[in-house]
């Protein structure tokens, strides 16, 4: 097809002859992909480019966090004419190329997902040889990792005036609701701290004053499940008289 651009004075500016509608750089990635921790996810990425029938050397790259500057988590290179993209980098051995870059597909499989993988990922392709060109997705794909609650720490700590307090920290996505139960407590959603900076999936609940000996149980729950852990408080009571 032929696309003609005309300026306001009706002068012919330029005429571009296109053999197909895909003769420009573009990348197609979904805004977000969701998967459960421990499972696998696929980060889809396909692209179009202006270099017809390019079969020279190419490199496929995925980075995390931010475009252009974020750390690479995967890289592979295909030699001239080769359909095989030889993996050169796979962070922790968990990133695997599903797509065929020769067919404009850079889709990536991420295995054994962890909550720390919850971030944005950016695909990039580089052509070398006769043609030198490169393109990277600007907005990337957000990998949203969900997880059932897991209590990562539960402890009893001394507090002023010979008292004791209990802390329970759990992780999960969505962030779990924490509840304490124990002697003379019933069920209380005590003093939940907001997720800490840089630890968005961690939630802490404090029980400020343990007034009775016995078992104190912390329960963490979200839409994917629940988890429980307990601590025991037994104070030494000296003989009187």
């Amino acid at each position: 097809f032929v696309r003609t651009k005309i300026d306001t004075t009706e002068n012919l500016l330029n005429t571009e002859v296109h053999s197909s509608p895909a003769q420009r750089w573009s990348m197609q990635v979904p805004p977000e992909v969701s998967a459960e921790a421990g499972d696998a996810a696929v980060l889809p990425c396909t692209f179009t480019h202006p270099h017809r029938h390019y079969d020279g050397p190419l490199t496929a790259i995925w980075r995390a966090g931010e475009p252009y500057a974020g750390p690479q988590v995967f890289r592979c290179a295909a030699a001239r004419g080769s359909e095989l993209c030889q993996t050169a980098l796979s962070l922790h051995g968990r990133f695997r190329l599903l797509g065929n870059p020769r067919r404009n597909d850079l889709s990536l499989r991420v295995e054994r997902l962890a909550l720390a993988d919850d971030r944005r990922y950016f695909c990039r392709v580089e052509f070398a040889g006769d043609v030198h060109d490169r393109y990277e997705s600007r907005h990337g794909v957000r990998l949203h990792v969900t997880a059932a609650p897991r209590i990562v720490n539960i402890s009893v700590l001394p507090s002023p005036a010979h008292a004791f307090r209990a802390l329970c920290t759990a992780e999960g996505e969505p962030p779990p609701a924490l509840a304490w139960s124990g002697p003379a407590l019933g069920n209380s959603l005590a003093a939940v701290r907001s997720p800490r900076e840089g630890h968005g999936h961690l939630v802490t609940a404090e029980l400020p004053a343990l007034t009775h000996d016995g078992r104190y149980t912390c329960t963490a729950a979200n839409s994917l499940g629940r988890s429980e852990a307990s601590v025991y408080l037994f104070r030494f009571h000296g003989a009187s008289g």
């Epitope: 696929v42 980060l43 889809p44 050169a88 051995g93 190329l97 599903l98 797509g99 499989r109």
Partner: antibody, heavy 121, light 111 residues
Framework: EVQVVESGGGLVQPGGSLRLSCATS????????MNWVRQAPGKGLEWVAQ??????????FYAESLEGRFTISRDNSKSTVYLQMNSLRAEDTAVYYC????????????WGQGTLVTVSS | DIVLTQSPDSLAVSLGERATINCRAS??????????IHWYQQKPGQPPKLLIY???NLASGIPARFSGSGSGTDFTLTISSLQAEDVATYYC?????????FGQGTKVEIK
């Protein structure tokens, strides 16, 4: 031309051991994952084990029922993969196939002719 | 483990006719549009041969009369016009989750 050739099969008594070898040629061995798949006489296919390549830290994976008895390994300098089988049982009797898979896909694009392992007293 | 169930167990089709084999997974094997189901052909006395990978991609050197389709839990292998050399047992395999598992096989014969 891709070639995958298994050897080391034979008759072994229950409780015995056997080491299978798989020699490959015609492709860059270092670029691929290697697997063993078995087929009991007249039965279907069962995946046994996988070993990944250097980039993927030579990670190994096993069918749950076999883990602890079978060990997969590879020698890149010889383009060869091995399956060490210990504490063999009658139900391990099968043709053992060595297969190749791409780093991006756990499907088996080349298969050897297989080697028969018979566990019997 | 993901269980794959093939149907039918055996199939007799006239030469030139269409043969259809189904494979049902016990849970979804599709992620973000990628289906981790693969099909193999095994002739008597030979090792299996890859026909279709990731549900619908024809493996190298395989005739175009073979095709695959499906998503989620239900997949189909179709031989559009059965030839004498297609007599074999066909297996599906999943790589969605380890351990990789196979269907029990479907034997295709000439009617």
């Amino acid at each position: 031309e891709v070639q995958v050739v298994e050897s080391g099969g034979g008759l072994v008594q229950p409780g015995g051991s056997l080491r299978l070898s798989c020699a490959t040629s015609g492709f860059n061995f270092n670029d691929y994952f290697m697997n063993w798949v078995r087929q009991a006489p007249g039965k279907g296919l069962e995946w046994v084990a996988q070993i990944r390549n250097k980039i993927y830290t030579y990670a190994t994976f096993y069918a749950e029922s076999l883990e602890g008895r079978f060990t997969i390994s590879r020698d890149n300098s010889k383009s060869t993969v091995y399956l060490q089988m210990n504490s063999l049982r009658a139900e391990d009797t099968a043709v053992y196939y060595c297969t190749r898979s791409l780093t991006g896909g756990d499907y088996f694009d080349y298969w050897g002719q297989g080697t028969l392992v018979t566990v019997s007293s | 483990d993901i269980v794959l169930t093939q149907s039918p167990d055996s199939l007799a089709v006239s030469l030139g006719e269409r043969a259809t084999i189904n494979c049902r997974a016990s849970q979804s094997v599709t992620i973000s549009g990628y289906s981790f189901i693969h099909w193999y052909q095994q002739k008597p006395g030979q090792p299996p041969k890859l026909l279709i990978y990731r549900a619908s991609n024809l493996a190298s050197g395989i005739p175009a009369r073979f095709s695959g389709s499906g998503s989620g839990t239900d997949f189909t292998l179709t031989i559009s016009s059965l030839q004498a050399e297609d007599v074999a047992t066909y297996y599906c395999q999943q790589s969605r989750k380890s351990p990789w598992t196979f269907g029990q096989g479907t034997k295709v014969e000439i009617k």
